[in-house]
Interface confidence: medium
C-alpha cells in the first residue's frame, strides 16, 4: 500500500489499557522512555481496522512511532511526543480509546543532569526544608517500560542543610530491597533505579527533614512489560554502496529485536524482464540466510567478493520475528576498472557513472 | 497495482433500479473499508454509502438512506451498490473508493444517468 | 451546501503561491483527520493530502497541508499550469455518521 500500513503488534495486554471510550487517561513518561499506549477492544471483541491520532491527526508507521491495531509505542520520547492521543474506527474515525500523554525531564533516565541541584547556600540564617525546584516535582506518576532507569528527584533546601530518606510504600526503602540495588545521590537529592521491574511499582516518597521541619514528597511508578513488536532496523542501513569491477564489498544491517530476529539477505532479480510477480511481490533470490553455525552478527553483514557488474543491483535486509517483519533496501552500483576507464577515454568514449 | 473498475451504469427511468459493481485488485480487498461517491454533472463530490471490513457494518448519506443498500463479495472482491426507488436528482458519476479512513484510491467511475 | 466550507474559486499565476480553506466544525474537522483530493478535468479524484498534512507517495512536496481548529488549509506553492483543477477537502462527520466533502475549489492559472 502507497500510506498508512498498519504495523501489526500484537501480544499481552499493555501494563496501562486503554480507558473506556469517552474517559481520558492521564498518561506521564520520561524525556527518552518509549510511550507505549495499548486500547483493547471494548468487551473483548473483535477491534476492527483502526488508526491513531494525536492533536487531531493521524499517525503514520515510522522507525520511531509503531503503530498496530490496539497498541501504539513512540520510540525516545521527547516534548513533541506530548499531546491527546486516540485509537479510533478506521471508518468512523470514532474514538475507542483517549489518552492525554506528556512527556517530561525529570524524573529522567541516566544522570544527565548531576550537579544542577547541590545543596546551596541561600542566605537564610536558619528554616525549615523547602523545596529548590518545584517544577521539577510536578510529575506524580511515572510510567516507564521495564530495563529503563528511573530517578526521582527532590531537590530542596534549608538551614541547616536537610537530610533526605526515600520510603517506598510507606516502609523505609533501603538498597537491599531490591534485586540490583539502589543508588542514593544525597547530593542530588535523588534515588536512582536501574533495569527497573514490575516489583518494583509501588509509591515512592522522599523525606526531607531537618531540625525545625519536614516536607515529603510521593512519586507513583508504574513499570510496563515490554511489549513485543517486529524487528527494528537502523535507519540509513544497509547503505547505497559504489564499487569498482572486482573489488570487495559490505553492506550492513542492524537489527534490534526482544524476540528472536530471522536475518535473511535477498537480492532483487528479474524473472521474463520483470521485477515483480503477477501479485505484486518482487522476484528475489535468498543469498545469506541462518544456519546451523552462523551468529546474527555475521548474519548482519553481507559482503560480495570480487563484483561483477551482475551483482549491481538491489540488495534487501529481511529481519524476521514471531510477530512480524521488517526490510531496509539498498542498491549496489558497479563500475568499470579504472584501466578500462582510462582505454575508454583514450578513445573517446564517455561513461556516465 | 491498485485497480477499482466500475461497472453496471446506464439509463433507468425514475422509479427503477440498477446494481452497481466495482472490480477490485492489487491489494487485499477484505482488509479495506470501501465507499461509494458520486458526483453529478458540473457538481462537487457526495458521498454515498460505506462498507466496514471487520464487520459489515453499513453507512448512507441522508440522501439515499432506504433507497440504496451496499453490500460486498470479499470472495469475489467486489463491491456493490444496489439502487432502488432511483431519481433524477441521482444522475451521477459514481466512484467506489478504498477508505484509510481517506480515499486513497478511486475507480474511474461509472454513469448513472435517471430520465424519462 | 455543503457541511464543509470552500470558496468557490481561487487563482493564481506560475510560481505563486496560493492556499486553499476549508471551514467545518467540531463534529468534523475539530474531531477528524482531514484530506484533500485534486480532480483534473475529465478524471477521477486524487488523494493529495492524507492525516492533514501527510502526503502519499508520487504527491510534489510543493502541495502541504495543515489544520488549526475547525478549519484545515491545502497550500499549494510554485503554482504550475497543470495544478488546474478542482481541490475538495473531506472528512468523516461524527454527528452526521457519515464522510463529507466541501464544495470544492477551481483552481485556475493564470
Known amino acids: 500500500e502507497s500510506l498508512g500500513t498498519e504495523q501489526r503488534v500484537v501480544g499481552r495486554a499493555a501494563e496501562v489499557p486503554g480507558p473506556e471510550p469517552g474517559q481520558q487517561e492521564q498518561l506521564v513518561f520520561g524525556s527518552g522512555d518509549a510511550v507505549e499506549l495499548s486500547c483493547p477492544p471494548p468487551g473483548g471483541g473483535p477491534m476492527g481496522p483502526t488508526v491513531w491520532v494525536k492533536d487531531g491527526t493521524g499517525l503514520v508507521p515510522s522507525e520511531r512511532v509503531l503503530v498496530g491495531p490496539q497498541r501504539l509505542q513512540v520510540l525516545n520520547a521527547s516534548h513533541e511526543d506530548s499531546g491527546a492521543y486516540s485509537c479510533r474506527q478506521r471508518l468512523t474515525q470514532r474514538v475507542l480509546c483517549h489518552f492525554s500523554v506528556r512527556v517530561t525531564d525529570a524524573p529522567s533516565s541516566g544522570d544527565d543532569e548531576d550537579g544542577e541541584d547541590e545543596a546551596e547556600d541561600t542566605g537564610v540564617d536558619t528554616g525549615a526544608p523547602y523545596w529548590t525546584r518545584p517544577e521539577r516535582m510536578d510529575k506524580k506518576l511515572l510510567a516507564v517500560p521495564a530495563a529503563n532507569t528511573v530517578r526521582f528527584r527532590c531537590p530542596a533546601a534549608g538551614n541547616p542543610t536537610p537530610s533526605i530518606s526515600w520510603l517506598k510504600n510507606g516502609r523505609e526503602f533501603r538498597g537491599e530491597h531490591r534485586i540490583g540495588g539502589i543508588k542514593l545521590r544525597h547530593q542530588q537529592w535523588s534515588l536512582v533505579m536501574e533495569s527497573v521491574v514490575p516489583s518494583d511499582r509501588g509509591n515512592y516518597t522522599c523525606v526531607v527533614e531537618n531540625k525545625f521541619g519536614s516536607i515529603r514528597q510521593t512519586y507513583t511508578l508504574d513499570v510496563l512489560e515490554r511489549s513485543p513488536h517486529r524487528p527494528i532496523l537502523q535507519a540509513g542501513l544497509p547503505a547505497n554502496q559504489t564499487a569498482v569491477l572486482g573489488s570487495d564489498v559490505e553492506f550492513h544491517c542492524k537489527v534490534y529485536s526482544d524476540a528472536q530476529p530471522h536475518i535473511q539477505w535477498l537480492k532483487h532479480v528479474e524473472v521474463n524482464g520483470s521485477k515483480v510477480g503477477p501479485d505484486g511481490t518482487p522476484y528475489v533470490t535468498v543469498l545469506k540466510t541462518a544456519g546451523a553455525n552462523t551468529t546474527d552478527k555475521e548474519l548482519e553483514v553481507l559482503s560480495l567478493h570480487n563484483v561483477t557488474f551482475e551483482d549491481a543491483g538491489e540488495y534487501t535486509c529481511l529481519a524476521g520475528n514471531s510477530i512480524g517483519f521488517s526490510h531496509h533496501s539498498a542498491w549496489l552500483v558497479v563500475l568499470p576498472a579504472e584501466e578500462e576507464l582510462v582505454e575508454a577515454d583514450e578513445a573517446g568514449s564517455v561513461y556516465a557513472g | 497495482e491498485v485497480q477499482l473498475l466500475e461497472s453496471g451504469g446506464g439509463l433507468v427511468q425514475p422509479g427503477g433500479s440498477l446494481r452497481l459493481s466495482c472490480a477490485a485488485s492489487?491489494?487485499?480487498?477484505?482488509?479495506?473499508?470501501m465507499s461509494w461517491v458520486r458526483q453529478a454533472p458540473g457538481k462537487g463530490l457526495e458521498w454515498v454509502s460505506a462498507?466496514?471490513?471487520?464487520?459489515?457494518?453499513?453507512y448512507y448519506a441522508d440522501s439515499v438512506k432506504g433507497r440504496f443498500t451496499i453490500s460486498r463479495d470479499n470472495s469475489k472482491n467486489t463491491l456493490y451498490l444496489q439502487m432502488n426507488s432511483l431519481r433524477a436528482e441521482d444522475t451521477a458519476v459514481y466512484y467506489c473508493?478504498?477508505?484509510?479512513?481517506?480515499?486513497?484510491?478511486w475507480g474511474q467511475g461509472t454513469l448513472v444517468t435517471v430520465s424519462s | 451546501q455543503s457541511v464543509l466550507t470552500q470558496l468557490p474559486s481561487a487563482s493564481g499565476t506560475p510560481g505563486q503561491r496560493v492556499t486553499i480553506s476549508c471551514t467545518g466544525s467540531?463534529?468534523?474537522?475539530?474531531?477528524?483527520?482531514v484530506s484533500w483530493y485534486q480532480q483534473l478535468p475529465g478524471t477521477a479524484p486524487k488523494l493529495l493530502i492524507y492525516y492533514d498534512s501527510h502526503r502519499p507517495s508520487g504527491v510534489p512536496d510543493r502541495f502541504s497541508g495543515s489544520k488549526s481548529g475547525t478549519s484545515a488549509s491545502l497550500a499549494i506553492s510554485g503554482l504550475r499550469s497543470e495544478d488546474e483543477a478542482d481541490y475538495y477537502c473531506?472528512?468523516?462527520?461524527?454527528?452526521?455518521?457519515?464522510?463529507?466533502f466541501g464544495g470544492g475549489t477551481k483552481l485556475t492559472v493564470l
Open positions: 492489487g491489494f487485499t480487498f477484505s482488509d479495506y473499508d
Open positions: 467540531s463534529s468534523n474537522i475539530g474531531n477528524n483527520t
Open positions: 473531506g472528512t468523516w462527520d461524527d454527528s452526521l455518521n457519515g464522510y463529507v
Open positions: 462498507i466496514s471490513s471487520s464487520d459489515g457494518s453499513t
Open positions: 473508493a478504498k477508505h484509510l479512513p481517506n480515499f486513497d484510491y
